[in-house]
Amino acid sequence: EPHSLRYNLTVLSWDGSVQSGFLAEVHLDGQPFLRYDRQKCRAKPQGQWAEDVLGNKTWDRETRDLTGNGKDLRMTLAHIKDQKEGLHSLQEIRVCEIHEDNSTRSSQHFYYDGELFLSQNLETEEWTVPQSSRAQTLAMNVRNFLKEDAMKTKTHYHAMHADCLQELRRYLESGVVLRRTVPPMVNVTRSEASEGNITVTCRASSFYPRNIILTWRQDGVSLSHDTQQWGDVLPDGNGTYQTWVATRICRGEEQRFTCYMEHSGNHSTHPVPSGKVLVLQSHW
């Protein structure tokens, strides 16, 4: 998977009036990395691993960048003619990626009230607008405003692309992101299903990177794909991921099943608890 940096900014308006402040989150390699603390008006790292990326350096640069981006987005929202009564939102998502072959990608996307209406490839400067008439109108509004704004010139878009990649490389240089391997904690649980059946669920949590194999085996042999149900691999908020796999088995057959996990070259297998709780015996 490529390394990526993703900025997600949102500004709000109420009855046509743009609200002060903004919401901002930054994801590094798909993990919550920074957020803008509106009380303290500062960029704050999300968890210990994020703090480790910059070590003892301050987050002034990130605070300045996010503040500037938030101000720009508020001005853009002020120029959208669609302002009606009630609450409205304008969201900008900017993503840059560095792939294994060192090629790069950058893009920018605008959403109004949660609906995508304008995208731009920051390398080719090519704009894309969805077919709907509302999206077309909103896109025209925003593009006209961006053209009027002297800052939004060709060089500005190149700079956005370059800045994003520069920041991403700066974070990667710390080595924290590249080096980090956090093995999963694996937990198997059982729950009653229909008469005579139980559902066994295998959960893997707190692992990094996100690539993982998690599958049920019967008599040591992997079950077919269609007899298992998988959860998405999702960030758990601590800079790590979580996922699960479940299958339905006959009660009493637990001893024939194991959950197999493979992650970053390590593996483990996990049995199903029988449901009977017996006192563990110690051998003296």
Epitope: R217, G220, E254, Q255, R256, P271, S274, L280, H283
Partner: antibody, heavy 118, light 107 residues
């Protein structure tokens, strides 16, 4: 730590019955099945079958159907192998082995030597 | 039943040697193969599961490989405590079957 402790050596005559025990320590007995494996003198290992320690249901390999019986005393975390109508060819060392996921013999007993004389 | 064959019943090697023990199945077993060690006193121990995955506590000088019908166990740097008989076991089908064993001795 996990241990399987088997009963001592047995010397029996043809036609008699023997019951070998295997006591488990260090884990929840009913979470894992128990395998039984035969090793004739100077020979390899032969899987006899296994018993589900949760349901008590035994599964026997074809060569061990009939005179062989697996049983449990769950409260004592003990599995048993009983062989009826002993024959000379039953002379062997018998091992219990924890059945992990019904594919792996991850912990073994020390073996019980059975000698059958005519 | 699936027949497991260990063609070399005994093998002589020197300490520090790299030793490879082979095992072949009468039909493809899709890597569903385990390796066990039996010491001269009869004690049995799991070494490797699923062709190449080392059981916890097993020294890294042991490794396994193979596919289809042909599998092998390698000891990279023979130590005195490795003197034992080694068995392969398939779990692709029931009944579970073992190879005849390969006895490793010191030259």
């Amino acid at each position: 730590q996990i241990q399987l402790v088997q009963s001592g050596p047995e010397l029996k005559k043809s036609g008699e019955t023997v019951k070998i025990s295997c006591k488990a320590f260090g884990y929840t007995f009913t979470n894992y099945g128990m395998n039984w494996v035969k090793q004739a003198p100077g020979k390899g290992l032969k899987w006899m079958g296994w018993i589900n320690t949760y349901t008590g249901e035994p599964t026997y390999a074809d060569d061990f159907k009939g005179r062989f019986a697996f049983s449990l005393e769950t409260s004592a975390s003990t599995a048993y192998l009983q062989i009826n109508h002993l024959k000379n060819e039953d002379t062997a060392t018998y091992f219990c082995a924890r059945n992990y996921g019904n594919y792996l013999f991850d912990y073994w007993g020390q073996g019980t030597t059975l000698t059958v004389s005519s | 039943d699936i027949q497991m064959t260990q063609t070399t019943s005994s093998l002589s090697a020197s300490l520090g040697d790299r030793v490879t023990i082979s095992c072949s199945a009468s039909q493809g077993i899709s890597n569903y193969l385990n390796w066990y060690q039996q010491k001269p006193d009869g004690t049995l121990k799991l070494l490797i599961q699923y062709t190449s995955l080392l059981h916890s506590g097993v020294p890294s000088r042991f490794s396994g490989s193979g596919s289809g019908t042909e599998y092998s166990l390698t000891i990279s740097n023979l130590e005195p405590e490795d003197i034992a008989t080694y068995f392969c076991q398939q779990y692709s089908k029931f009944p579970r079957t073992f190879g005849g064993g390969t006895k490793l001795e010191i030259k």
